[in-house]
């Protein structure tokens, strides 16, 4: 069982939120896999990185991603008192100087080389789910999450009115 807070009808603009510190509160090196235990892998092809979702062979080493966690104040149009509190945001870096980016126009997830400060497209609202899973919501596009589509990562719009469970936006983090 799992739950999504960021949904299509959610009207508050995440891009108005502010990262409360330029340095992360903590960092975590982990492998990333889907709800169905497929691994997220990164391959250097033609001087750019490609992202794949695949079953690894037995004893094949999983790629690691550095997750950097940040505190962020959630903007609150619904109430001026900040009652929505702070949320957690994350950036994901599989290799030095490269970060996962949300390409909202193409509905794609890409690896871009960039310097700090990172652009908003590199930040994702971290959702704590049941089943030991997390989900990643685009900071720049509320209600849009990193998900799995055709063995690739893609941006997927989540609609709260859909009465079905979508497991393709759930991810597992593991140190092994």
């Amino acid at each position: 069982a799992f739950g999504i807070s960021g949904v299509q009808k959610y009207t508050r603009a995440l891009h108005d939120s502010s990262i409360t510190g330029i340095s992360p509160i903590t960092e975590y090196l982990a492998s990333l896999s889907t709800y169905n235990d497929q691994s997220i892998t990164f391959a250097l092809e033609d001087e750019s990185y490609e992202i794949y979702v695949e079953d690894l062979k037995k004893d094949e080493k999983k790629d690691k991603v550095l997750l950097s966690y940040y505190e962020s104040q959630h903007p609150s149009n619904e109430s001026g008192d900040g009652v929505d509190g702070k949320m957690l945001m994350v950036t994901l870096s599989p290799t030095k100087d490269f970060w996962l980016h949300a390409n909202n126009k193409e509905h794609s997830v890409e690896l871009h080389k960039c310097e700090k400060p990172l652009p908003d497209q590199a930040f994702f609202v971290l959702h704590n789910m049941h089943s030991n899973c997390v989900s990643f919501e685009c900071k720049t596009d509320p209600g849009v999450f990193i998900g799995v589509k055709d063995n690739h990562l893609a941006l997927i719009k989540v609609d709260s009115s859909e009465n079905l469970c979508t497991e393709n936006i759930l991810f597992k983090l593991s140190e092994t």
């Epitope: 069982a1 799992f2 739950g3 999504i4 807070s5 960021g6 949904v7 009808k9 959610y10 009207t11 509160i25 903590t26 960092e27 975590y28 090196l29 982990a30 997750l67 966690y69 959630h74 619904e78 109430s79 009652v83 929505d84 509190g85 702070k86 949320m87 957690l88 609202v125 971290l126 959702h127 704590n128 789910m129 049941h130 030991n132 997390v134 989540v158 609609d159 709260s160 009115s161 859909e162 009465n163 079905l164 469970c165 979508t166 983090l173």
Partner: antibody, heavy 121, light 111 residues
Framework: EVQLVESGGGLVQPGGSLRLSCAAS????????MNWVRQAPGKGLEWMAE??????????HYAESVKGRFTISRDDSKNTVYLQMNSLRAEDTAVYYC????????????WGQGTLVTVSS | DIVMTQSPDSLAVSLGERATINCRAS??????????LNWYQQKPGQPPKLLIF???SQGSGVPDRFSGSGSGTDFTLTISSLQAEDVAVYYC?????????FGQGTKVEIK
């Protein structure tokens, strides 16, 4: 103003039933996981139940002490979460708080004022 | 279930002095590289209020004198300079696993 207002508490005999309601206002209710937490007189806090969203088929979770006796539900059209309490026991006597989890589901950050349930003959 | 144990049960501290409350979990509450440990303050006749989440991050609007630390199984809430309005019961809570469990509470009073 963001508000949660509980109602339905009162005196009930052991073995009886009661339904608590929690009316939410000031936020988009259908977007948030909701919880019930109770506090026996002069005692500490005890988490009771949680319900997620329509998107998740309203999945529910319970404390072992109330599993099979209590049922959490919600009506998004009425901005209300409920706690149906059956087979009540003296040890269920407590203030029952309705509570909302924050954006991203990391902690509870909105609480109602609570409603008192007394189970006694 | 994860059992949360706080110490001491009560604490009397002079105004302006430091107050320290400890919380121990029966097993690690770490997950995803974070500690799923929250601290709440409850004043008489009121519902609880969030102070600290993921062990050390301050809740919105929480005064800087409140800080949290720790990881794994051992955690601390510190009030650096106790004020009269800090008289309350303080609870730790783990949100790593269902059922979410609270410590028994620590009552903080003015000496």
């Amino acid at each position: 103003e963001v508000q949660l207002v509980e109602s339905g508490g009162g005196l009930v005999q052991p073995g009886g039933s009661l339904r608590l309601s929690c009316a939410a206002s000031g936020f988009t209710f259908s977007n948030y996981w909701m919880n019930w937490v109770r506090q026996a007189p002069g005692k500490g806090l005890e988490w009771m139940a949680e319900i997620t969203l329509k998107f998740n088929a309203y999945s529910t979770h319970y404390a072992e002490s109330v599993k099979g006796r209590f049922t959490i539900s919600r009506d998004d059209s009425k901005n209300t979460v409920y706690l149906q309490m059956n087979s009540l026991r003296a040890e269920d006597t407590a203030v029952y708080y309705c509570a909302r989890r924050n954006y991203g589901n990391w902690y509870i950050n909105v609480w109602g004022q609570g409603t008192l349930v007394t189970v006694s003959s | 279930d994860i059992v949360m144990t706080q110490s001491p049960d009560s604490l009397a501290v002079s105004l302006g002095e430091r107050a320290t409350i400890n919380c121990r979990a029966s097993e690690s509450v770490d997950k995803f590289g974070m500690s799923f440990l929250n601290w709440y303050q409850q004043k008489p006749g009121q519902p609880p209020k969030l102070l600290i989440f993921v062990a050390s991050s301050q809740g919105s609007g929480v005064p800087d004198r409140f800080s949290g630390s720790g990881s794994g199984t051992d955690f601390t809430l510190t009030i650096s300079s106790l004020q009269a309005e800090d008289v309350a019961v303080y609870y730790c809570q783990q949100s790593k696993d269902i059922p979410y469990t609270f410590g028994q509470g620590t009552k903080v009073e003015i000496k």
